[in-house]
Amino acid sequence: TPLGPKWPEPVFGRLASPGFPGEYANDQERRWTLTAPPGYRLRLYFTHFDLELSHLCEYDFVKLSSGAKVLATLCGQESTDTERAPGKDTFYSLGSSLDITFRSDYSNEKPFTGFEAFYAAEDIDECQVAPGEAPTCDHHCHNHLGGFYCSCRAGYVLHRNKRTCSALCSGQVFTQRSGELSSPEYPRPYPKLSSCTYSISLEEGFSVILDFVESFDVETHPETLCPYDFLKIQTDREEHGPFCGKTLPHRIETKSNTVTITFVTDESGDHTGWKIHYTSTAQPCPYPMAPPNGHVSPVQAKYILKDSFSIFCETGYELLQGHLPLKSFTAVCQKDGSWDRPMPACSIVDCGPPDDLPSGRVEYITGPGVTTYKAVIQYSCEETFYTMKVNDGKYVCEADGFWTSSKGEKSLPVCEPVCGLSARTTGGRIYGGQKAKPGDFPWQVLILGGTTAAGALLYDNWVLTAAHAVYEQKHDASALDIRMGTLKRLSPHYTQAWSEAVFIHEGYTHDAGFDNDIALIKLNNKVVINSNITPICLPRKEAESFMRTDDIGTASGWGLTQRGFLARNLMYVDIPIVDHQKCTAAYEKPPYPRGSVTANMLCAGLESGGKDSCRGDSGGALVFLDSETERWFVGGIVSWGSMNCGEAGQYGVYTKVINYIPWIENIISDF
């Protein structure tokens, strides 16, 4: 029996009956075995077929076999009800080999010419399966020349049998307090040859509860307990299962915070699997009762491990734990069933006793000593000598625990000294030097420190003076002995003040004229204002209208008198302002250098002389009455003049204060 070509030779060719195209002889048997490479099959078709027809092809026939299976037994020329002729059919081997057998019996009624066939190897498409047959691959089948391979969808891995896709379903850990898990593909059939492990791992103190929901369908056996596919549930205490079949298992209260669920499947079956909804419980904490004037959020029927609540107080109440305040409060339920923090109180906000107001007082409006939420107090300043700056003095205890003004300020109001009050009134006439009476010049300051000088009180902690009067002490401010509230220069009864700092105008040059002869002394403490100690006002923008030529100003001091000695009692003199050009001209004659009188100066005195300030008065104020406000203001600072005080044709020269308002305001606001 001749063999067909063997792989790896080219696998194609022609077969024919003996003697073809002539008639075949009797008693012939010829066998061909064709072999294709693995993964290939053989295709065979006939171009000529003429064999003796017999019942079931018992006499002459061509038999096609592949392995043990007979593909066809052929005879005749055309098919009948019981016999088959190939016609235009193509025949395929089942595997990679095909056996062809030709046989003729001992006789033929007439001559038959036999057959001619052609064959070739072709790739088997293993991915094509007949209806009703199991698919070649579980998921994806990929054909190629000489073979095929299977692959799997994401989340699956190819089993070692190279066809089945096993689910990658292990290592999932559920840490939420509730959730759902199910067999792979649920509710579609679960995969074969899979071993799934799911873990529920909650914090210690929780207990997992498992509920099987919807449907349960796991391959089972009528006699043996879950021999094929099964579901098992394991805790640190016990094992539940195995489960299979179609009945939903009962709820499982595991009493454990960790659960392992194992699901194993074999290579067969078509079942939808299972779905579990899990919840958890824990020892509940005591129900939180909101403190008075507070509320709990969120409100729950019960609070278990990890549950929390917050306390919110009504407006005007604050969270307190004991004596310690809290901005917010949240308590968390612990595994032992206790809250991690004690319940706070919502205490009414208490702003506490209001701060004392310097030079003022406070009155309880709501009730004596009432300092709680919405309580009202009223600050006021000591009448006559102080006035309240900016606000009305009414403060309310607000929810933030601070006394707050109607403008929303939390700082105290300020009692500012009233300036420019004097016991003296002026009739406008020029008088000779006179003794001052108590309260006439309450702004008058006596400055001792090397020489005798003067100054004027501004606000309650500044003294305005001449730069030349304090120049020597500019770096040793504490050396200045500052006295106020007295008329008698040598009296032991005075209010003592000390300097904290001396600010000399940066434009002043000592011993080189008196331009910018102005200085400020900051006191180290505020002085108490009364009828004998009152600050002088600074000039308003409109003040120039009260300082025109011939307007009367008043200078005061303890300087030299006509007798050539320092005055024992405070003296004053009313003197008119002198025309600036006239004054400039008076000081352009020798021994005075040109330009001695500048635009930063003003002059006052009589052309005839006799009324003047003198040495020892330096730094004192030349004051004017503002008839609109009825307050005295400082227009000049005693600066310089002729060597002989009160000399005819010469005038006292004063620093023009209105030119220095920005400088004064900047120093005072900065320091």
């Epitope: 734990q321 004991g322 923090r341 004690p342």
Partner: antibody, heavy 118, light 108 residues
């Protein structure tokens, strides 16, 4: 991590004022809680001095109220102690601290030692 | 003010011994607002027990706290060398906050 750090002069003359600073890192002093000053005398006795709360309100030990002021600078996350008219009895280690009103929210500085001596 | 009295002022215990120290208040204190601190030389006090009975984190379970009203105690079930320290109670129930004078625990 929350940290508190005290800083101060170490030596102060009698009758002068003591100023200490507590610098807080890892938590804003306006977020919550009371920010306390506590001192420990040489014999180890502890005394609470006072606090400034998250809102800026203060509470003082009545025994120190007339001499004590606690303030803060929220921009620098610092709070301060000022004790006036100190004397030898104020010699101690001074701590700034948050006292636990919440689980484990209790932090102390390492302390700064103050000696009052002429 | 509430005065806290700790007793004994000094005590010593052998390894493995049970130790109890007390803190007595001059007037009633809510157990929620009583703390215990441990302090070792050269260190600041460390919160040891809060709400009179809850252990701060890192505190060994051999420690326990109990009490109510005016009487509180701290107990060590089995003394270990590292427990040698001074223990202070603190109340923040009412102002001013007050500390006990401390109990110094030494290893015998």
């Amino acid at each position: 991590d929350v940290q508190l750090q005290e800083s101060g002069p170490g030596l102060v003359r009698p009758s002068q004022s003591l100023s200490l600073t507590c610098t807080v890192t890892g938590y804003s002093i306006t977020s919550d809680y009371a920010w306390n000053w506590i001192r420990q005398f040489p014999g180890n006795k502890l005394e609470w001095m006072g606090y400034i709360s998250y809102s800026g309100r203060t509470s003082y030990n009545p025994s120190l109220k007339s001499r004590l002021s606690v303030t803060r600078d929220t921009s620098k996350n610092q709070f301060f102690l000022q004790l006036n008219s100190v004397n030898a009895a104020d010699t101690a280690t001074y701590y700034c601290a948050i006292i636990s009103t919440a689980v484990d929210f209790d932090y102390w500085g390492q302390g700064t030692t103050l000696t009052v001596s002429s | 003010q509430i005065v806290l009295t700790q007793s004994p002022a000094i005590m010593s215990a052998s390894l493995g011994e049970r130790v109890t120290m007390t803190c007595t208040a001059s007037s009633s204190v809510s157990s929620s607002y009583l703390l215990w601190y441990q302090q070792k030389p050269g260190s600041s006090p460390k919160l040891w027990i809060y709400s009179s009975s809850k252990l701060a984190s890192g505190v060994p379970v051999r420690f326990s706290g109990s009490g109510s009203g005016t009487s509180y105690s701290l107990t060590i079930s089995s003394m270990e060398a590292e427990d040698a320290a001074t223990y202070y109670c603190l109340q923040y129930n009412r102002s001013p906050l007050t500390f006990g004078a401390g109990t110094k625990l030494e290893l015998k």
